[in-house]
């Protein structure tokens, strides 16, 4: 089911236990460490001690990352997988998650996504079923990583606040982002709204409050009038290019 995928993920075993324990009751799934690396304060890893964030699936990485083995040959054969930087427009890809926000994988190339090209309720997974080298397809995590177009054609896209696994589960103008203990469909950010600017790829782990990316024509930048002693907790907002 949707939520247990996130909460029972194999990769969770790599994380430290929840601070102070306390979350899930007996009989519930598991109390996930909510903020392995926090968005503010001094909780970010520094460049000196930075280590790649281990993962088992794309959903554990940020919106600008995907989960893969750093060396191609080791993929899916017990090699360590980490969150890698997403691929920009016109770069090679094997699945949508590899492409940066606003793009999707078409014929092995990251292309700009345009929701108007997809019939309502259609999932953006049309070309990846035939890719035999998609290592996530055989992740052995007990649920189908990909759903064929035919079975999804009549599926209503997730509305704001409903649970999701990936952004293609959500309606136009929404992305799939973590909020509290689950992943839900959240609005793509508009001008002036608070956004999250990560220090570097993979620096944020399982944030408990992920945000969508800024909408078209906007970039996530430090709020100009926001002067604060602590650089790491400065607010970033979506601003015009």
């Amino acid at each position: 089911t949707l939520n247990s995928v996130l909460i029972n993920s194999n990769a969770i075993k790599n994380l430290p236990p929840p601070l102070g324990g306390a979350g899930g009751q007996p009989g519930s799934a598991v109390s996930v460490a909510p903020g392995v690396l926090y968005e503010g304060g001094n909780k970010y890893q520094t460049l000196d001690n930075y280590q790649p964030y281990p993962c088992a699936e794309d959903e554990e990485c940020g919106s600008d990352e995907y989960c893969s083995s750093p060396s191609r040959g080791a993929a899916g054969v017990g090699g360590v997988q980490i969150c890698l930087a997403c691929r920009k427009r016109r770069k090679r890809c094997m699945r949508h998650a590899m492409c940066c926000p606003g793009n999707y994988c078409k014929n092995g190339i990251c292309m700009p996504s345009d929701h108007s090209h997809f019939p309502r309720g259609e999932i953006e997974e049309s070309i990846i079923e035939n890719l035999g080298n998609d290592h996530n397809a055989a992740a052995g995590d007990g649920y189908p990583r990909r759903t064929t177009l035919t079975s999804k054609i009549y599926h209503t896209k997730g509305q704001e606040g409903s649970v999701c696994l990936r952004s293609s589960d959500c309606a136009a103008g929404l992305c799939c982002a973590r909020h509290f203990w689950s992943k839900i469909c959240k609005p793509v950010l508009k001008e002036g709204q608070v956004c999250t600017k990560h220090k570097r790829k993979g620096s944020h782990g399982l944030e408990i409050f992920q945000r969508c990316y800024c909408g078209e024509g906007l970039a996530c930048r430090i709020q100009k009038d926001h002067h604060q002693a602590s650089n790491s907790s400065r607010l970033h907002t979506c601003q015009r290019h």
């Epitope: 089911t1 949707l2 939520n3 247990s4 909460i7 029972n8 929840p18 601070l19 102070g20 306390a22 979350g23 899930g24 009751q25 009989g27 519930s28 799934a29 598991v30 109390s31 909510p34 903020g35 926090y38 968005e39 503010g40 304060g41 909780k43 209503t156 997730g158 509305q159 704001e160 606040g161 409903s162 649970v163 909020h179 509290f180 203990w181 689950s182 839900i184 959240k186 002036g192 709204q193 608070v194 999250t196 944030e207 408990i208 409050f209 945000r211 907790s233 607010l235």
Partner: antibody
Amino acid sequence: QVQLVESGGGLVQPGGSLRLSCAASGFTFSSYWMSWVRQAPGKGLEWVSVISSDSSSTYYADSVKGRFTISRDNSKNTLYLQMNSLRAEDTAVYYCARHGIDFDHWGQGTLVTVSS
Amino acid sequence: DIALTQPASVSGSPGQSITISCTGTSSDLGGYNYVSWYQQHPGKAPKLMIYDVNNRPSGVSNRFSGSKSGNTASLTISGLQAEDEADYYCQSYDSPTDSVVFGGGTKLTVLG
């Protein structure tokens, strides 16, 4: 439109039990996490518990842990709160809330009074 | 225990702007660039006004805005109107207990 209607509140003696229900309509109930939030008379809001859309995960406030149990029946679009070993300090209006992007929709609440 | 601290009351005249503060710690409000605000009229259920620091749900007036600096979040209401008179609650998340936390609430009085 989204509607949440609580029921099951009433007067109960300390140590007693009560089961609250929340009937949901106007949205795909099985796609949302749901919470209970309470408010003692003249006091502020206090989060009580949350349950995942598929019931696989539950979380509780320390003040009710071990005494209250949250559950849901997606086939009936209903959320429940089983309250055992009730204390005077549990007296409050209990709201069920849809836990989408935070508590984006609330019921009107049901009053639970614990008194001898 | 109230984890987030709000002033018990604030007041302002119609047309004025007021700001309600909400102070937490590094384990809750300060640990995340995240906070929500709710409005509650007497005898009514709370209503979500702001989420994720400064995002307004559809249908909420743009007179309501949110911000955050360090361990303190703020709700600003501009162009005060009589119907804004209500209790306002901030809400965040506490990582040590893995739970949702609310502020104690602030009663807003619109004078005149």
